[in-house]
Amino acid sequence: NQDLPVIKCVLINHKNNDSSVGKSSSYPMVSESPEDLGCALRPQSSGTVYEAAAVEVDVSASITLQVLVDAPGNISCLWVFKHSSLNCQPHFDLQNRGVVSMVILKMTETQAGEYLLFIQSEATNYTILFTVSIRNTLLYTLRRPYFRKMENQDALVCISESVPEPIVEWVLCDSQGESCKEESPAVVKKEEKVLHELFGTDIRCCARNELGRECTRLFTIDLNQTPQTTLPQLFLKVGEPLWIRCKAVHVNHGFGLTWELENKALEEGNYFEMSTYSTNRTMIRILFAFVSSVARNDTGYYTCSSSKHPSQSALVTIVEKGFINATNSSEDYEIDQYEEFCFSVRFKAYPQIRCTWTFSRKSFPCEQKGLDNGYSISKFCNHKHQPGEYIFHAENDDAQFTKMFTLNIRRKPQVLAEASASQASCFSDGYPLPSWTWKKCSDKSPNCTEEITEGVWNRKANRKVFGQWVSSSTLNMSEAIKGFLVKCCAYNSLGTSCETILLNSPGPFPFIQDNIS
């Protein structure tokens, strides 16, 4: 065994940046650091066969399989994949190790399988086997976390039944409103499943895996806060767990909290209380109402009452199926070139939606913000004043929703012209859609004031580019204007733009760009 070469097999992951690299190049794209694949001699095999850890790759990922050989002298090599021989160019690194690489670009099913590398060195011949398969991400899921009470303890467990198993974290905040944004210094994150500190202002649990991140907020009624103008509403699907926390602070311990559903006290086993003294010696009590698996008859007004605070309620609505409620009628907007403007969609949905904004086949991240009235809003401001069609798409486990917007930017026309043997055409994308005039320039009319009305054909909205309308006007050539300069002008309420064309022979001849008023 002593005279066998020391073999190191590594996997290099590439961040795809659409570079087109040949199959067996040694220097591909932007790379992650190499991962050791634990190459070892295959037990009980005839001949010297090394085997690398099996590799599982996402569809479309790009990787390099690489072998580093610590053996004296030169080496020659050959890759074999599905009975086909592939070229192999070894080179030497700074430690004088032989380096052989196989680049797999944008992994597909056809590139999965066994890659055999045959190496011949001065001392010995050996084979290295790589097994590459495609990761089955169809099985991946990411489910919204939910809460359970920990057995025999006043603590909550956060559970997310997801594949691969997610990292679960509690996101806690003790201040009000905006300062509880995710990256605010007031926010504390705890990467654990069990939470004992349940007195905070805002408590969320988040789960994340390869598919992203999902969060669930602990629904809270704070008796020391002024009630919202509209009754807070909580939606749940049949079978889901219900958790509502009622919180109250008082100068001393002489107060109690109770939960009622539709004026009937909750049954024993559907609530538990915790209390603590805060730093200023006031007493904080919290009372949880919970149902491990809700049914339709758990719908109703849940009221938290205190002997020292005004009571507050929340409406719990149990639905069979998730929903997205919003108006889906399309909306058209026209704005000035430098006007600040955002699209917005107001919706009510359960479970929480995943959404995207799309323009010109490009998707943009979608943020949603909860409003006090139980509605949520998503705004899109990143349109960069590009006119066209914008699409908002939202979905959750049970429903889908799409809404179209058209954005028109008020600006004066800009004219492009082209000419052929038989006609001249002008195009403009100004908004409002422009009107057209054609003028002939001659000795009689050096300023091109002689209007042409014969043979003019206007087409409004001749083509739609991602919702952007283009207007055109075509002038059919007649003997009367052949050989002359003609001028097409597009005008709207914001101004006029003209282009001059020489009508003499075939081919596109825009001649001069005229003054634009």
Epitope: L11, A54, T131
Partner: antibody, heavy 124, light 107 residues
Framework: QVTLKESGPALVKPTETLTLTCTLS??????????VSWIRQPPGKCLEWLAH???????SYSTSLKSRLTISKDTSKSQVVLTMTNMDPEDTATYYC????????????????WGQGILVTVSS | DIQMTQSPSSLSASVGDRVTITCRAS??????LAWYQQKPGKAPKRLIY???SLQSGVPSRFSGSGSGTEFTLTISSLQPEDFATYYC?????????FGCGTKVEIK
Amino acid sequence: QVTLKESGPALVKPTETLTLTCTLSGFSLNNARMAVSWIRQPPGKCLEWLAHIFSNDEKSYSTSLKSRLTISKDTSKSQVVLTMTNMDPEDTATYYCARIVGYGTGWYGFFDYWGQGILVTVSS
Amino acid sequence: DIQMTQSPSSLSASVGDRVTITCRASQGIRNDLAWYQQKPGKAPKRLIYAASSLQSGVPSRFSGSGSGTEFTLTISSLQPEDFATYYCLQHNSYPLTFGCGTKVEIK
């Protein structure tokens, strides 16, 4: 260069929960078929396998300690975490993490690399 | 659970000696066995995997043999750096189990 490094408290009190982290470098539990195990060794005693977690997130636990152990991984941080509840002085040991490699033809790459170990003492 | 019984639990030998350590499984484990060497205060180091395959970088004086229930680690000519404790591990079925070690001491 493959390395595994254990971190966590050197001292825990009886009934408390122990959380140990194994930080990996030079390999990952992302694309290659690999697993990371936790193994412990009480002073002057035998090695005892506790648990392992595979790159596809499957887990296996020691039968006798199953109810007390939880193993998890965070691929983005290259970490494997072991928690052990209700610690007892009997759990005083050096805790190691080690790598397992799964080959195309089977899992025979058990514990080819080990961390240096962390001595955890359980005492009030 | 599969029990792994290692023998002897300790032995004294001199440099140059041939040393044999045995590991017996309570049921058949094919060749799903590895051997490890551990020195005081250090983590174990793998010597042999799949019962008889030598770990890369391990001197060829170490060899492994056996299949089923009886396995042997042999050091053909003991060197000063070989004084340590040796463990076998079965990875045929859960839970994975180690033998309780054989301590090789200087005579």
